[in-house]
Each structure stands twice: as structure tokens, then as C-alpha cells.
Interface confidence: medium
């Protein structure tokens, strides 16, 4: 029996469409597939950022694949052809690997890129990113932010920069339609008359950087002689009630009594008849049902009851 062989795919390349990290990997069918006309050829694609220990592996019948990468590092990929066992009367046949790499030739020394990039999606409504200028860069250096997510035709530049001493140090984003639960890509590059500036690339998902508004309208209600119900309302905005976790801090007679995390807008507290003062604050965070991560809101305004014996009155602030 002659050994069945197959060639690797042709013209394997990584194409950058200008989406700040979302790249196309594409290829053409291997040469000499005439023997296997009745066969559906498959391709095994492996790719990673250079320096990563693990490869991502995809098996596909298509001639392209798209995914997001960290453009601060290079990318390497390899692909080979697979002939399923149905085509070869027995075992699967694999071609040799075709390999390719891609990287953006870095300009400037690493110290010139922006420092301490921080992005917060306030109340799941307003995205704000801020940064510090690179180390030792001159005041003539200015930074520009570009962003892209799936659904935009092309990368967009920030139109509302936050400035300090004439330098851009942040961006207030416009309304970002249908932008959550997908990768959000940012590039901050820079220009200076004196020296080249290193670009920085960032990728995150907006629902994971949400900082909600604090809860509002805190109230007390006497439930029984030894129980008080603390209650509050979710802040206005697009975040549904099911997406909140709350942290409560309760002080009884100036002593920290309880810190608790709860999933709904009430908390029942056991008290004694001797309690003279009760204060509590609440803060909110998007929970694990709606995001993988989040930022605690600021604490609500403190709500207190003092003076009258708590057991004698219904407490509706």
C-alpha cells in the first residue's frame, strides 16, 4: 500500500483589519486535493500570544477563523490539514504544519506608554477610562484613544478627552450600543516631537467593570419586638434588580455590629430593647449571575435612628 499524504494549507496568514486586537487567521486549501474530492477536509488550527504557555486549538472546515489577541505581544499560529479516517480507509492523516507569526513593530521604549490605565463602566451606562502619561515623557506628548467592539464598522477615536496640563489623560465614551458581553478593544497611542511613543492595547468586557450607583431610600421597619427590617431601593438605571449583590454595614450604639452580604433589598436584624441608636449603610455590586467581576459602588448615605426606644415605634425614617 502506498502511504496516503496530504499537503498543509496554503497561504496561511494573520490579517489585522484594524480592530485593535481582533485578528483574522486565513488560509487556502492544500495543493493536490484531487484524490480526495469526495472528502470533507478539516483543518486543525493552533494559535497563541507569544509567551503564553498554552495553545488554543480549533478544528474547522472553514478557510478562516477570527479571535482576539493581545497586540502588546506577538502572535504565533500553526495549521495543518486533517483527512478524516473515512477518506483514508483507516486512520486519520495529518499534513505537516504551516506556521505564521504577526506582531506590531513596537515604536518607542516601554516607559513611554500610558501608565495605570483604569476603565470603569459607571452604572452600566457611562464608560470612562483614565491613565497617567508615560514615565519621563515631555509635555508635548499627547495620547489618543481608539476603541472597537463587534458591531462597529471600524475603530473609533475618543471624541471627549479628559485633559490635564494640556495632555489627554482620559476618555469619556459616548453611549455604546450593544457593547456588553463581548470583547471591547482599546488602543492608546501617542505622539511627540522628540521621541516615538509606545502604543498600549487593552481588552475587557464592559459588564465586568461596572460600578453601580449606591442604593437609595434606606428605611427601617419594626418586624417584631426583637427584629428590625432594613430596606433600600435599587438605584435608577439599566441594571435589573436580579443583578445586584449588597454589602451592609450596621452600627449599633457606635459599635460595628454586622457586616453582611445579601442578594435582595432587605436585611432582618436581631436587636435588643436596650438599643438606643442604629445606623446602616449599603453598597451594591453586580453579581455573578450577570458578570464575572465588578466594582463596589460608593456607600449609600448613612441612615440612622436614634433617641427613642426602637421597640416603641415603627421606623419609617
Amino acid at each position: 500500500d502506498t502511504e496516503i499524504k496530504v499537503n498543509p494549507p496554503q497561504d496561511f496568514e494573520i490579517v489585522d483589519p484594524g480592530y485593535l486586537g481582533y485578528l483574522y487567521l486565513q488560509w487556502q486549501p492544500p495543493l493536490s486535493l484531487d484524490h480526495f474530492k469526495e472528502c470533507t477536509v478539516e483543518y486543525e488550527l493552533k494559535y497563541r500570544n507569544i509567551g503564553s504557555e498554552t495553545w488554543k486549538t480549533i478544528i474547522t472546515k472553514n478557510l478562516h477563523y477570527k479571535d482576539g489577541f493581545d497586540l502588546n505581544k506577538g502572535i504565533e499560529a500553526k495549521i495543518h490539514t486533517l483527512l478524516p479516517w473515512q477518506c483514508t480507509n483507516g486512520s486519520e492523516v495529518q499534513s505537516s504544519w504551516a506556521e505564521t507569526t504577526y506582531w506590531i513593530s513596537p515604536q518607542g521604549i516601554p516607559e513611554t506608554k500610558v501608565q495605570d490605565m483604569d476603565c470603569v463602566y459607571y452604572n452600566w451606562q457611562y464608560l470612562l477610562c483614565s491613565w497617567k502619561p508615560g514615565i519621563g515623557v515631555l509635555l508635548d506628548t499627547n495620547y489618543n484613544l481608539f476603541y472597537w467592539y463587534e458591531g462597529l464598522d471600524h475603530a473609533l477615536q475618543c471624541v471627549d478627552y479628559i485633559k490635564a496640563d494640556g495632555q489627554n489623560i482620559g476618555c469619556r465614551f459616548p453611549y455604546l450600543e450593544a457593547s456588553d458581553y463581548k470583547d471591547f478593544y482599546i488602543c492608546v497611542n501617542g505622539s511627540s516631537e522628540n521621541k516615538p511613543i509606545r502604543s498600549s492595547y487593552f481588552t475587557f468586557q464592559l459588564q465586568n467593570i461596572v460600578k453601580p450607583l449606591p442604593p437609595v431610600y434606606l428605611t427601617f421597619t419594626r418586624e417584631s419586638s426583637c427584629e428590625i427590617k432594613l430596606k433600600w431601593s435599587i438605584p435608577l438605571g439599566p441594571i435589573p434588580a436580579r443583578c445586584f449583590d449588597y454589602e451592609i454595614e450596621i452600627r449599633e450604639d457606635d459599635t460595628t455590629l454586622v457586616t453582611a452580604t445579601v442578594e435582595n433589598e432587605t436585611y432582618t436584624l436581631k436587636t435588643t430593647n436596650e438599643t438606643r441608636q442604629l445606623c446602616f449603610v449599603v453598597r451594591s455590586k453586580v453579581n455573578i449571575y450577570c458578570s464575572d467581576d465588578g466594582i463596589w459602588s460608593e456607600w449609600s448615605d448613612k441612615q440612622c435612628w436614634e433617641g427613642e426606644d426602637l421597640s416603641k415605634k415603627t421606623l419609617l425614617r
Epitope: Q125, V216, Y217, L236, G237, P238, D301, K302, C304
Partner: antibody, heavy 119, light 111 residues
């Protein structure tokens, strides 16, 4: 608990001015907007303006044609409303009223200050 | 200015029955997906009390029988089962644009 305590009733001559105070307690004064609303005898409510004590930002109802001035003193947690060029139709109860933000309504009101304008 | 028109001017309802008050704005009071519409109750000799904010959210300590609905220009305050202590004047108010404006009020009485 939250309290807004207003200054006492006033009787004023037409053409004069009145300044009503509103002392806030039981909450962080600078975290809430302070509104001023008036109500003529037997009539409805009329919003006069508001101040954000945090940064001093003020919005007025232009119907008062520059006759109203709203101020706030963070150090004493007190808001003030001054109405000048008084006329008889300014006779009303004037309320200060706390609001968390524009979409949250006005959740605490002062007891009201009756200003009577009469010659 | 946004003009708020309330109807009816007065309303008499039997104890335990449903009371419905309507408010229409001269233009939409919605923004950012929120309706900037609030409802207040005022009893004689007292300042108003916030019942409903953002069209449908209850203020602090407001009984569950009070509810609000609507969006855009048309809004409704509903008292599901009228109690004696609900006799008052009810006002709607928009806070989308300065100047904030109130409806003319609806006087609710017991039949």
C-alpha cells in the same frame, strides 16, 4: 432622622425682599439637591429652583425673572431662598425640599414658611 | 416649559375601591430609559409627600396599595383599595427638564 427646619412666617411690603432659611440635619447635606417650591393659598405647587450644595450649581425657574436667589452654606447645612421685588401674588407657603437626584423626586420637605405680601 | 395636565380635577371613590388619577405631559418626559415622573400626596396643612418616583417606584414607607405606571407622555397613579387616610390632593410632577412642573392636582374624596 432627616429634618428640614425652615425659618418662621414673614409679613412683607410690596417691593421689598424676603429671605427664607432651611436648616438640614440627619443626612449629608452636600449629597442631595435642595429645591424650593411654593404654594399660593388654595393653589397648586410651583417649582422655583434648586441648588446642588456640593458644587454650588443652581437652576432657576425663569418665570421668576431674576427675582429669586438660592444659596447654600455647607458649613451650617443651611439653604436659603431670597425673593425680591415682592408683590401681592407672591403670598404663598414656601417649602424647601430635598432630592436625591433629578429622577428621584423630592423625598423630604420642610414644614413650610408662610410669606404674606401686603401693603 | 413642559405642561402637566391632570385628570380628573376631583374624584370621589368608595372605601376599598380602586382610585385612578391620570397625568399627561405636553412632551415626553423619558430620558436614558427612565421616566422622570413623580407623584405626591398632600393633606391639608402639611407639605407634600413623595409617593412614586421614576413613574413606578415607591417612595420610602409608601403603602403597597399605591402604584404608578406609564411612560412617555401618559402616566397613571392607582390606589388599589382606598383607605380613609388617602383623602388628599395628589400631584404629578416632571423632573426631566428645568423648570420642574407640577400638574394642577386632583382632589380625592370618599364617596
Amino acid at each position: 432622622q432627616v429634618q428640614l427646619v425652615q425659618s418662621g412666617a414673614e409679613v412683607k411690603k410690596p417691593g421689598s425682599s424676603v429671605k427664607v432659611s432651611c436648616k438640614a440635619s440627619g443626612y449629608t447635606f452636600s449629597n442631595y439637591l435642595m429645591n424650593w417650591v411654593r404654594q399660593a393659598p388654595g393653589q397648586g405647587l410651583e417649582w422655583m429652583g434648586r441648588i446642588d450644595p456640593y458644587d454650588g450649581d443652581i437652576d432657576y425657574n425663569q418665570n421668576f425673572k431674576d427675582r429669586v436667589t438660592i444659596t447654600a452654606d455647607k458649613s451650617t447645612s443651611t439653604a436659603y431662598m431670597e425673593l425680591s421685588s415682592l408683590r401681592s401674588e407672591d403670598t404663598a407657603v414656601y417649602y424647601c425640599a430635598r432630592g436625591y437626584g433629578t429622577a428621584y423626586g423630592v423625598d423630604y420637605w420642610g414644614q413650610g414658611t408662610l410669606v404674606t405680601v401686603s401693603s | 416649559d413642559i405642561v402637566m395636565t391632570q385628570s380628573p380635577d376631583s374624584l370621589a371613590v368608595s372605601l376599598g375601591e380602586r382610585a385612578t388619577i391620570n397625568c399627561r405631559a405636553s412632551e415626553s418626559v423619558d430620558n436614558y430609559g427612565i421616566s422622570f415622573m413623580n407623584w405626591y400626596q398632600q393633606k391639608p396643612g402639611q407639605p407634600p409627600k413623595l409617593l412614586i418616583y421614576a413613574a413606578s417606584r415607591q417612595g420610602s414607607g409608601v403603602p403597597d396599595r399605591f402604584s404608578g405606571s406609564g411612560s412617555g407622555t401618559d402616566f397613571t397613579l392607582t390606589i388599589s383599595s382606598l383607605q380613609a387616610e388617602d383623602v388628599a390632593v395628589y400631584y404629578c410632577q416632571q423632573s426631566k427638564e428645568v423648570p420642574w412642573t407640577f400638574g394642577g392636582g386632583t382632589k380625592l374624596e370618599i364617596k
